[in-house]
């Protein structure tokens, strides 16, 4: 049986996909099914991550790399490496302990995740409100009233798009 031996640490010869058994003269052993080692010279193989329940497999495990998970439709990833799946809400809502709740007046959320955030206060920048905010959209700030002096061209913003069949809020 042929193998190459290192003059330094014999385990450094064990490639990814194997582990080095210190108890047996630094022999390289292949990772068993459903386990992996992503670098050479490892003393153990790690068990593959299993994407179960609300998690689904984005990338299968191999002997040299772990599985990667994402979330089933209606949920989104949270945490490093998608360690958690959190329920989606609609735009204009935020997730609370009691489920998805509409954003309070004066706040908005333009995503299916995260919390409702306050509308921008245009006056803090000396500007005026061009387009009113909604639960789903922030306000749009325009020029300050002083900028609209006589002779200056006023800006008429386009009306915000609305879905057919939905009355204005």
């Amino acid at each position: 049986f042929e193998r190459t031996r290192s003059l330094q640490d014999p385990c450094s010869n064990c490639p990814a996909g194997t582990f080095c058994d210190n108890n047996r003269n630094q022999i390289c052993s292949p990772c068993p099914p459903n386990s992996f080692s992503s670098a050479g010279g490892q003393r153990t193989c790690d068990i593959c991550r299993q994407c179960k329940g609300v998690f689904r497999t984005r990338k299968e495990c191999s002997s040299t790399s772990n599985a990667e998970c994402d979330c089933t439709p209606g949920f989104h990833c949270l945490g490093a490496g998608c360690s958690m799946c959190e329920q989606d809400c609609k735009q204009g809502q935020e997730l609370t302990k009691k489920g998805c709740k509409d954003c309070c007046f004066g706040t908005f959320n333009d995503q299916k995740r995260g919390i409702c955030r306050p509308w921008t206060n245009c006056s803090l920048d000396g500007k005026s409100v061009l387009v009113n905010g909604t639960k789903e959209r922030d306000v749009v700030c325009g020029p300050s009233p002083a900028d609209l002096s006589p002779g200056a061209s006023s800006v008429t913003p386009p009306a915000p798009a609305r879905e057919p069949g939905h009355s204005p809020q």
């Epitope: 049986f1 042929e2 193998r3 190459t4 010869n13 064990c14 490639p15 990814a16 996909g17 194997t18 058994d21 047996r24 022999i27 390289c28 052993s29 292949p30 990772c31 068993p32 099914p33 459903n34 990338k59 299968e60 191999s62 002997s63 040299t64 790399s65």
Partner: antibody
Framework: EVQLVESGGGLVQPGGSLRLSCAAS????????MHWVRQAPGKGLEWVSY????????YYADSVKGRFTISRDNAKNSLYLQMNSLRAEDTAVYYC???????WGQGTLVTVSS | EIVLTQSPATLSLSPGERATLSCKAS??????VSWYQQKPGQAPRLLIY???NRYTGIPARFSGSGSGTDFTLTISSLEPEDFAVYYC?????????FGGGTKVEIK
Amino acid sequence: EVQLVESGGGLVQPGGSLRLSCAASGFTFSEFGMHWVRQAPGKGLEWVSYISSGGSTIYYADSVKGRFTISRDNAKNSLYLQMNSLRAEDTAVYYCARDWVDYWGQGTLVTVSS
Amino acid sequence: EIVLTQSPATLSLSPGERATLSCKASENVGSYVSWYQQKPGQAPRLLIYGASNRYTGIPARFSGSGSGTDFTLTISSLEPEDFAVYYCGQSYSYPLTFGGGTKVEIK
């Protein structure tokens, strides 16, 4: 679906050469080490060779050392076994398998006979 | 190299009966033993890995046990499709080695 398909087997005279191929699909070939395992007619399984995922580490059984060469082409999702100086005792069905030894090909028969 | 010895060489049983197959290693292989099923003209099929873990899609009637040098494959109630040759294999160290096989035949 994981698939391993061997080819290249056939009848060869003692002392001759053959090159076996294993075409892989349905998994990330470049992330798996690969084995060749053989089975003589009516006999048990015998491990032949291993190559690591990147091709940097290679192991051979003593019975084939110096005669067989394992290689891989990750761009082509292919594994190879170059067999030289073939002997009658090399007659077998040759299987390729992932390093987890969970999926095997259907095998290709190599017959060494004069 | 590590030698695996399987017994019995042949097991004659009827459908519905319990099958117990043995595999002994010449030295300690921890739990790095797998079991394979092979039918005529087919490639081996992985049943059990890590001595006791059923591989994906393998029916619950197949179970494995043991560690160190003594290992057992049990088929709790034989189905007609279970009559085949069974091999144990060790992946504790290279060269990988396999047992000589146990043929489970219909009585």
